[in-house]
């Protein structure tokens, strides 16, 4: 009876129809399983753990961008349970390569040790 329910649907035994799994609020993630016709009895939403965020719906919580450690950039806006961190300009001693295609992480800062001569962020 439930084989045709979608990714985020369970089979509601009261109506005989597929029904949307209850979506989570921003800052929460699903706990246990719901979808493709079944819903765990304990299915619900739980707050994101520290250093993670979620936009809600059926998203799991994801780790905030590590601006300083990975991107070697300053923190423009720290992340919270609902929003990712936003990175600002490069840390001292690092520069951003212009005209370089964005990778999946956005722009990454590179060490001034590898910079071409007269790179403005690395002069002085």
């Amino acid at each position: 009876e439930d084989s045709n329910c979608g990714e985020n649907e369970y089979h509601n035994q009261t109506t005989g129809l597929c029904q949307q799994c209850p979506p989570c609020r921003p800052g929460e993630e699903p706990y246990m399983s719901c979808g493709y016709g079944t819903k765990d009895d304990d299915y619900g939403c739980v707050p994101c753990p520290a250093e993670k965020f979620s936009k809600g719906g059926y998203q799991i919580c994801r780790r905030h961008k590590d601006c300083e450690g990975f991107f070697r950039a300053t923190v423009l806006t720290p992340g919270d349970m609902e929003n990712d961190a936003e990175c600002g300009p490069c840390l001292p001693g690092y520069y951003m390569l212009e005209n370089r295609p964005r990778n999946i992480y956005g722009m990454v800062c590179y060490s001034c040790l590898l910079a071409p001569p007269n790179t403005k962020e690395c002069v002085g």
């Epitope: 009876e1 439930d2 084989s3 045709n4 329910c5 089979h11 035994q13 009261t14 109506t15 005989g16 129809l17 597929c18 029904q19 949307q20």
Partner: antibody
Framework: EVQLQQSGPELVKPGASVKMSCKAS????????MHWVKQSHGKSLEWIGY????????SKNQKFKGKATLTVDKSSTTAYIQLNSLTSEDSAVYYC??????????????WGAGTTVTVSS | DVVMTQTPLSLPVSLGDQASISCRSS???????????LHWYLQQPGQSPKLLIY???NRFSGVPDRFSGSGSGTDFTLKISRVEAEDLGVYFC?????????FGAGTKLELK
């Protein structure tokens, strides 16, 4: 008296979209799911999907997932269906139907008069 | 999806005759809750469908007792004991046990 009043006939061009309405009266709008059913010319009935007016949650037949968008306006007790990227295959009569469920009964107990959609250039 | 097969597709009758329409499903319509969600709808000319029989054999409110439904599992029958003029139209069987709900192709009850 429970009634579902549907909007008038539509003549639309291929590739365009169309939005039809179904105004409910005579009952608690948020207490029943509203379903949409397609009847192609001289053919049988096909279930498109439903919307729960209480919370706007929808579920659709896989066949119509990219074709139909279901919405409601609780303040006017009106359900809507929008069909996009229309082709001649979408020419049909579209019915809204109230879905009764309770005591493990479930069925379409009230139907609108239908909206005829003709897709033609 | 569950396929609903109706026979015959056309049924010529005279007023006062008995009429019988068959409906067969491609899989059992017995729900895990024990109910069988096989319904019959009538679409009179130029009108929208109306519910006649729900859950195999239960007449919907206002439906005359000349209409009766029977069957189980995958085989179902709608009978009209004495056909009246207002009974003419297209009869659809429909299942609501499995998702999505599906309908038969319809049986047109018409005068000989």
């Amino acid at each position: 008296e429970v009634q579902l009043q549907q909007s008038g006939p539509e003549l639309v061009k291929p590739g365009a979209s169309v939005k039809m309405s179904c105004k409910a009266s005579g009952y608690s709008f948020t207490g029943y799911n509203m379903h949409w059913v397609k009847q192609s010319h001289g053919k049988s009935l096909e279930w498109i999907g439903y919307i729960d007016p209480y919370n706007g949650a929808t579920s659709k037949n896989q066949k119509f997932k990219g074709k139909a968008t279901l919405t409601v306006d609780k303040s006017s007790t009106t359900a809507y269906i929008q069909l996009n990227s229309l082709t001649s295959e979408d020419s049909a009569v579209y019915y809204c139907a109230r879905y009764y469920y309770g005591d493990y009964h479930w069925y379409f107990d009230v139907w609108g008069a239908g909206t005829t959609v003709t897709v033609s250039s | 999806d569950v396929v609903m097969t109706q026979t015959p597709l056309s049924l010529p009758v005279s007023l006062g005759d008995q009429a019988s329409i068959s409906c067969r499903s491609s899989q059992s319509l017995v729900h895990s809750n024990g109910n069988t969600y096989l319904h019959w709808y009538l679409q009179q000319p130029g009108q929208s469908p109306k519910l006649l029989i729900y859950k195999v054999s239960n007449r919907f409110s206002g439906v005359p007792d000349r209409f009766s439904g029977s069957g189980s599992g995958t085989d179902f029958t709608l009978k009209i004991s004495r056909v009246e003029a207002e009974d003419l139209g297209v009869y659809f069987c429909s299942q609501h046990t499995h998702v999505p709900p599906t309908f038969g192709a319809g049986t047109k009850l018409e005068l000989k």
